[in-house]
Interface confidence: medium
């Protein structure tokens, strides 16, 4: 969590002098309660906005907007604390709006906004706006909270943001997985325009279970420039296990911008429909002579049509 702080943060508006300050998320009014405190924010809204940095990078930001209630408590409103909590890490970042002049009633409802919290693709946040000073112990709460889920990099608008592009969002491998005879899967995917290696992670499962019955990782060497955007074909000859027929194929790139943390794409192959009569096992011999390893496939050939479910 961080602030997009390339320009001075502004909270002033006509009729109000205001400054934005970093906050420890522990306002002084917690420690020294005041007798008179303002009411809570009204109509808290959080939206996904996009902001450019001076360097030209584009980041997703949380646009936080709220209004004040039309009651006399605004006379005691000294500011607001904005808190963003990333739910999966418990990381919290706060800023404080400090009012330098007293609010007056005017015809229009007071409205505030802030769009400088940079958020991460696919993450969920809890956004809280606390009016200051905070309430006395056992006093009515004067904050409002809302959860905010940031779309992941598959989202069209997110895909072109700097964090998504850095993790390989523009690469669409268009994975296809085809079940062949003789316990084979043919995986095909489109290479990106970077000379970097890939890993194919294969996990197989029995028809109705979530215990894996086979796992392996395959290294695909970095393509040459003339292979960029070409299809790479990988044949995986699997362990022959009756029922070990549901395969998840995941492709992990190692682009220079994201290294070990690039977006993975995956496809799954469902178990084939059971035929009424068992298929005969074909006599099968590879066209080439194996050089190393050891051989063993258990049970009948699993034959199935091509399945292709592609996601990040």
């Amino acid at each position: 969590l961080r602030l997009l702080d390339h320009r001075a943060l502004v909270c002033s508006q006509p009729g109000l002098n205001c400054t934005v300050k970093n906050s420890t998320c522990l306002d002084d009014s917690w420690i020294h309660p005041r007798n008179l405190t303002p009411s809570s924010p009204k109509d808290l809204q959080i939206q996904l906005h996009f902001a450019h940095t001076q360097q030209g990078d584009l980041f997703p930001v949380a646009h936080i907007e709220w209004t004040l209630q039309t009651d006399a408590s605004i006379l005691y409103l000294e500011g607001a604390e904005l808190s963003v909590l990333q739910l999966n890490t418990n990381e919290r970042l706060c800023v404080k709006f400090q009012f330098l002049s007293m609010l007056q009633h005017h015809r229009k409802r007071w409205r505030f906004s802030f769009s400088h919290f940079v958020v991460d693709p696919g993450q969920e946040y809890e956004v809280t706006v606390h009016h200051l000073p905070k309430p006395i112990p056992d006093g009515d709460p004067n904050h409002q909270s809302k959860n905010f889920l940031v779309p992941d990099c598959e989202h069209a608008r997110m895909k072109v943001t700097t964090p998504c592009m850095s993790s390989g969002s523009l690469w669409d491998p268009n994975i296809t997985v085809e079940t062949l005879e003789a316990h084979q899967l043919r995986v095909s995917f489109t290479l990106w325009n970077e000379s970097t290696h890939y890993q194919i992670l294969l996990t197989s499962f029995p028809h109705m279970e979530n215990h894996s019955c086979f796992e392996h990782m395959h290294h695909i060497p970095a393509p040459r420039p003339e292979e960029f955007h070409q299809r790479s074909n990988v044949t995986l000859t699997l362990r022959n296990l009756k029922g070990c027929c549901r395969h998840q194929v995941q492709i992990q790139p190692f682009f220079s911008s994201c290294l070990n943390d690039c977006l993975r794409h995956s496809a799954t192959v469902s178990c084939p429909e059971m035929p009424d009569t068992p298929e005969p096992i074909p006599d099968y011999m590879p066209l080439w002579e194996p050089r190393s390893g050891s051989s063993d496939y258990k049970d009948d050939d699993d034959k199935g049509s091509s399945h292709h479910h592609h996601h990040h």
């Epitope: 215990h211 019955c213 392996h216 990988v234 096992i281 080439w288 050089r291 390893g293 063993d296 496939y297």
Partner: antibody
């Protein structure tokens, strides 16, 4: 160098449960299948069953109703339980590893072949079923 | 179950002889077959995997061939340490099954 060592009681009474453990040393139990095989004078070598490190099992249908194979990855061990034993279950019991990977690279396309077979065996433990 | 048969069940040979053992499967098993050597009181030791590939560390006088239903283990020049029992193992389908064995002894 991966080594396997079977352990368990050498004598089991009829109708009781035979329990054996295979300890894997010199390598990880992960990403392999692990087998139990037995050899009795009357029946030759007989495959009992196997287990993947994740817990997924396959059993010989002739023994399936009496066999349980389990794995403890934290101890690098897998175990065999054979219930309701009779004198016909007297045998030398072996544990064995199953699973190797070979890669073949072509131009622009890649072949990954899994060749299996029991390549590493324990030395075997004799179990006698007798009252 | 796939039934594996071996022939001969035993044979007597001399050092330096060429020895051939055959294994047949009751149905096609591609090349999913291994050959094992066992000496008395010892565990089986794999010689050949994938029907024809030599296990690392095994002398080159051992070779395997075949595919589908018929397989052969050949010892090109029998050595004193080769007197043992030889088994084939199919690992094409559950349950894995072994051949009954071929005992090779000194003539």
């Amino acid at each position: 160098q991966v080594q396997l060592q079977e352990s368990g009681p050498g004598l089991v009474k009829p109708s009781e449960t035979l329990s054996l453990t295979c300890t894997v040393s010199g390598g990880s139990i992960s990403n392999y299948y692990w087998n139990w095989i037995r050899q009795s004078p009357g029946k030759g070598l007989e495959w009992i069953g196997d287990i993947y490190y994740s817990g997924s099992t396959n059993y010989n249908p002739s023994l399936k109703s009496r066999v349980t194979i389990s794995v403890d990855t934290s101890k690098n061990q897998f175990s065999l339980k054979l219930s309701s034993v009779t004198t016909a279950d007297t045998a030398v019991y072996y544990c064995a590893r199953d699973g190797e990977l070979a890669n073949y690279y072509g131009s622009g396309s890649y072949q990954f072949y899994y060749y299996y077979g029991m390549d590493v065996w324990g030395q075997g433990t004799t179990v006698t079923v007798s009252s | 179950d796939i039934l594996m048969t071996q022939s001969p069940s035993s044979l007597s040979a001399s050092v330096g002889d060429r020895v051939t053992i055959t294994c047949r499967a009751s149905q096609g098993i591609r090349n999913d077959l291994g050959w094992y050597q066992q000496k008395p009181g010892k565990a089986p030791k794999r010689l050949i995997y994938a029907a024809s590939s030599l296990q690392s560390g095994v002398p080159s006088r051992f070779s395997g061939s075949g595919s589908g239903t018929e397989f052969t283990l050949t010892i090109s020049s029998l050595q004193p340490e080769d007197f043992a029992t030889y088994y084939c193992l199919q690992h094409n389908s559950n349950p894995f099954t072994f051949g009954p064995g071929t005992k090779v002894d000194i003539k």
